[in-house]
Amino acid sequence: KSSNEATNITPKHNMKAFLDELKAENIKKFLYNFTQIPHLAGTEQNFQLAKQIQSQWKEFGLDSVELAHYDVLLSYPNKTHPNYISIINEDGNEIFNTSLFEPPPPGYENVSDIVPPFSAFSPQGMPEGDLVYVNYARTEDFFKLERDMKINCSGKIVIARYGKVFRGNKVKNAQLAGAKGVILYSDPADYFAPGVKSYPDGWNLPGGGVQRGNILNLNGAGDPLTPGYPANEYAYRRGIAEAVGLPSIPVHPIGYYDAQKLLEKMGGSAPPDSSWRGSLKVPYNVGPGFTGNFSTQKVKMHIHSTNEVTRIYNVIGTLRGAVEPDRYVILGGHRDSWVFGGIDPQSGAAVVHEIVRSFGTLKKEGWRPRRTILFASWDAEEFGLLGSTEWAEENSRLLQERGVAYINADSSIEGNYTLRVDCTPLMYSLVHNLTKELKSPDEGFEGKSLYESWTKKSPSPEFSGMPRISKLGSGNDFEVFFQRLGIASGRARYTKNWETNKFSGYPLYHSVYETYELVEKFYDPMFKYHLTVAQVRGGMVFELANSIVLPFDCRDYAVVLRKYADKIYSISMKHPQEMKTYSVSFDSLFSAVKNFTEIASKFSERLQDFDKSNPIVLRMMNDQLMFLERAFIDPLGLPDRPFYRHVIYAPSSHNKYAGESFPGIYDALFDIESKVDPSKAWGEVKRQIYVAAFTVQAAAETLSEVA
């Protein structure tokens, strides 16, 4: 069949009909509906929302909508024994205590079940000791402390400011440094933009606002008790001592009013340089311990949270493909929130809801996509990407054989300045072509394309006249699809101006103040940015599901592979003598990249010329495109990270949110000058070059003529 047999509307009209059906007003209504009460993973409220979405997706016209449940490890504060931090005097008396909850925003004073700020999966404990300020608690911050300043964190409670890297990496670094507790806080330098009022009068973080979040180091494992397998009714669960990624020391988050009280007394070493100073009126002394008059005072943590196996629910909707029903294009985003989820995740969930409604409308008019579209409302993303990972573990055999693409749909906005896209290079041309067809919502770009405003505001650092597209990292539900299964993936949202706004994320991230009103009053009153994001996400899904030839360009992978090879070689070149001593050569990698480039070029030529009316040849060429991302998967995974299997990309070992290229080689080279056995260390570099070169060459060969 040709794809037109599946439809009573011409292909070009299909896309237009789909996009025209998307309405800002609907997204606004859906956002309001999803944000009136908290929807914390594992709660009755979130189960009820799952059933509501299931019902509405059925009404919208999907062929089937099912709930997929799993019993996973979650973490909650103890309702009768709250978490807090104290300053204690020499007699052990608590002379200062941090707040037990965030002051609720106007209109929400009587809402029940607002979970107080906590660090999910913190163990219980009441450590007391001297404080050390560790800046952002990045790898380089601990290098500065330990190597340059000779400050020992062993047996200390460290206080770190949020921002720059994933909080789980901060906790891991603190543990490795020997700390016995971690206090995380939001510094106004990172979460209070100058010239903007704090909520409810603006979008800045008030002093009593606190960022919640999990502090796991799962490395893609999913449920900590069932790594690699679904947490179903007959699952074998590990004991808590063998669980994956749990922190070993108590951790707790606070706002900047409370942080001020802790930091203002700090003594010991002065901050090493201005990059260690935030915006509070405190010296930012590193410590250890308090200054002069307060030197006998200590800090004590009181953490009583519990880990509990709890049922979670994904909603999975199916729109069956008319021509290739066994090829899946997936649009997924999470539903669970820390509190109201005004931005994270419901600004994304509202967009998914409207995309489903638009597809459903076309289906009711007799249209079907060429390929099957799966829609997912994931649960427990905030607790470690659990819902998406468990579902993918359960369905891995289907996904690895049938998965064409995964488009993520968490928060639609983190600002209102310009578009932000992270995706596989296979999708670069799809994104470029789509955004050229969409109208820009930006002021000053009336009548111009989204591509034009995006390129102007966020230019590519490498290619003039093109927009920046970033590498996929992690910290969201695409992780299992891309990093573990090798399914081509992408994400898009509206973002801030990174040049002028240096704060991390958006100020009210994961706080009680992330409300519907935050979005409606301050970020997107007309919901025009939400609509644009719906058009980008929905347009990508539409093209991936409906184009006769998959809209993947393998030549773009060739370009970035050369760039990544150059980058990793440049890092290695900082050790020229060792490269000579241990005969370290990157020639095999560059040779493989050259072969990939030539084969990809020939494949693209064949793609232009083949007979698209021959369904067997069409399917064959499409399968080569679909399986190209899969070819970058190493079944053995990366060292000590078995669920990160993509050889070209992995989440950075120092920041889960960031993507790293050739991560195996990168990690082998990282801090190599400090390794006790240089011969062994450089041997591992050589092994990782070998793995990367082999993988690139093997991937190239999947694009060769089949016989």
């Epitope: 150059d566 980058k567 070689y569 020639d587 560059f590």
Partner: nanobody, 118 residues
Framework: EVQLVESGGGVVQPGRSLRLSCAAS????????MHWVRQAPGKGLEWVAT????????EYVDSVKGRFTVSIDNAKNTLYLQMDSLRAEDTATYYC???????????WGLGTLVTVSS
């Protein structure tokens, strides 16, 4: 043939300046990065500096930061290393290293000797 040729070395007093050049033939500086590496007499190779792409970003070994500046002139297809406030410990043979955008193996120049002595 792809080759890199360094020039500009010589004998100079401590505190003075030198400018090294590295002319490329057979390929253009469209490659990702170009590097300067040095080898002091009787010592191993030491990385000195890297300049990326269009010359917008560069990195230096700690011992030369604030004294050395790497730059590129794409029109002349030449890489430079401006060396100021030279010290005796900067005495070395300086090599430039790069890789043509289509080549598999890196290209090393033959080197130019810099001697810092009073």
């Amino acid at each position: 043939e792809v080759q890199l040729v360094e020039s500009g070395g010589g004998v100079v007093q401590p505190g003075r300046s030198l400018r090294l050049s590295c002319a490329a033939s057979g390929f253009t500086f469209s490659s990702y990065a170009m590097h300067w590496v040095r080898q002091a007499p009787g010592k191993g190779l030491e990385w000195v500096a890297t300049i990326y792409q269009d010359g917008s970003e560069s990195e230096y070994v700690d011992s030369v930061k604030g004294r050395f500046t790497v730059s590129i002139d794409n029109a002349k297809n030449t890489l430079y290393l401006q060396m100021d406030s030279l010290r005796a410990e900067d005495t070395a043979t300086y090599y430039c290293v790069g890789r043509a955008s289509t080549s598999i193996t890196p290209v090393w120049g033959l080197g130019t000797l810099v001697t810092v002595s009073s």
